[in-house]
């Protein structure tokens, strides 16, 4: 598999700043991701009035959002950090499809979506690096996502609405686990 | 909108020092990688490294890791490399390019600056 | 180091014409491939980002595909603004690195 950027072993810095260790570098663009997905949550609430919703209704949606659970080990309690990286790295390829249909909901934060989109992107290359066991990494199938997307645009206003803010509230959640799991390996 | 303005054209004597500065106008600095690309007369491009502006992490091609030096100035919003010993093998033009967060296409690019390396 | 090539240095077409520019990264660089046009003034613009996404500006005739190693961009209708030189770039692996890149020449 392709090196990721900054994780070459040819690579070096300039003598002024140490290159950051893999598990920094990790961190931080989950940290840049998150600041990116406040803002665009920010432009989504300030649109409608999903934000104000219970959780309970919004709870009632048939997207299949990945989530962590306990059989993941990415929590403290059965912790497994193997079982853990396939899982943060499966659930962010999952996510790829939801974040690309965010791409035409923002009108002010469009660069921002894209930027979300991308790093993401960079994110699963220093992951996939870090994993030993890259077979048990299953990809999503292209046709699957392909119309999960095509049915997605096809909603009304208010349930793109609904899948907007639910996309971003769900991939928040779980980069949030993935960092706290992170910061254990 | 996005702006990258790079500072003017320079005429160096070979040994001397070359700073080149990349202002940088219409989106927050410290959010996205900020890289470097050299491209000799009539050749292609060629990436000499790129430097976070939020905590100025580099990270340089091998090639030019004694060469260039890349630094930021966040209260100016404004990156600058630096190389040393410039030989005519520097004449070039040099271009700075942000990305798309922390990403590695080059989303927007400045207008280059002509180094000519000249006794 | 990535090698990216691009057979064609320079590529003949007529104002109106379908135009394809190949590029091949020497490993598997997956789909982290983008495109950019350089204008004879040295100014440069993304066109094309991972492979396909069109760049926010860029005119929908031009479109990219491919995936692995093999990697190419469409010009559907060729117009007197798109005559510039075209590079590719793998974003899989540092150091970056660039295609030689092909320039569109009018017949």
């Known amino acids: 598999a392709p090196v990721p950027p900054g994780e070459d072993s040819k690579d070096v810095a300039a003598p002024h700043r140490q290159p950051l260790t893999s598990s920094e570098r990790i961190d931080k663009q989950i940290r840049y991701i998150l600041d990116g997905i406040s803002a665009l949550r920010k432009e989504t609430c300030n649109k409608s009035n999903m934000c104000e919703s219970s959780k309970e209704a919004l709870a009632e949606n048939n997207l299949n959002l990945p989530k962590m659970a306990e059989k993941d080990g990415c929590f403290q309690s059965g912790f497994n950090e193997e079982t853990c990286l396939v899982k943060i790295i499966t659930g962010l390829l999952e996510f790829e499809v939801y974040l690309e249909y965010l791409q035409n909901r923002f009108e002010s934060s469009e660069e921002q979506a894209r930027a979300v989109q991308m790093s993401t992107k960079v994110l699963i290359q220093f992951l996939q690096k870090k994993a030993k066991n890259l077979d048990a990494i299953t990809t999503p199938d292209p046709t699957t996502n392909a119309s999960l997307l095509t049915k997605l645009q096809a909603q009304n206003q208010w349930l793109q609405d609904m899948t907007t803010h639910l996309i971003l509230r769900s991939f928040k959640e779980f980069l949030q686990s993935s960092l706290r799991a992170l910061r254990q390996m | 909108q996005v702006q990258l303005q790079q500072s003017g054209p320079q005429l160096v004597r070979p040994g001397a020092s070359v700073k080149i500065s990349c202002k940088a106008s219409?989106?927050?600095?410290?959010?996205?990688?900020m890289h470097w690309v050299k491209q000799r007369p009539g050749q292609g491009l060629e990436w000499i490294g790129m430097i976070d502006p939020s905590d100025t992490e580099t990270r340089l091609n091998q090639k030019f890791k004694d060469k260039a030096t890349l630094t930021v100035d966040e209260s100016s919003s404004t990156a600058h490399m630096q190389f040393k010993r410039p030989t005519s093998e520097d004449s070039a033009v040099y271009y700075c390019a942000r990305a798309y967060g922390f990403s590695i296409e080059f989303a927007y690019w400045g207008q280059g600056t002509l180094v000519t390396v000249s006794a | 180091d990535i090698q990216m090539s691009q057979t064609s240095s320079s590529l003949p077409a007529s104002l109106g014409d379908r135009v394809t520019i190949s590029c091949k990264a020497s490993?598997?660089?997956?789909?982290?491939l983008n495109w950019y046009q350089q204008k004879p003034d040295g100014t440069v613009k993304l066109l094309i980002y991972?492979?396909?996404r069109l760049h926010s500006g860029v005119p929908s005739r031009f479109s990219g595909s491919g995936s692995g190693t093999d990697f190419s961009l469409t010009i559907s209708n060729l117009e007197q603004e798109d005559i510039a030189t075209y590079f590719c770039q793998q974003g899989a692996t540092l150091p970056l690195t660039f295609g030689a890149g092909t320039k569109l020449e009018l017949k």
């Open positions: 991972y492979t396909s």
């Open positions: 490993q598997d660089i997956r789909s982290y």
């Open positions: 219409g989106y927050s600095f410290n959010r996205s990688w």
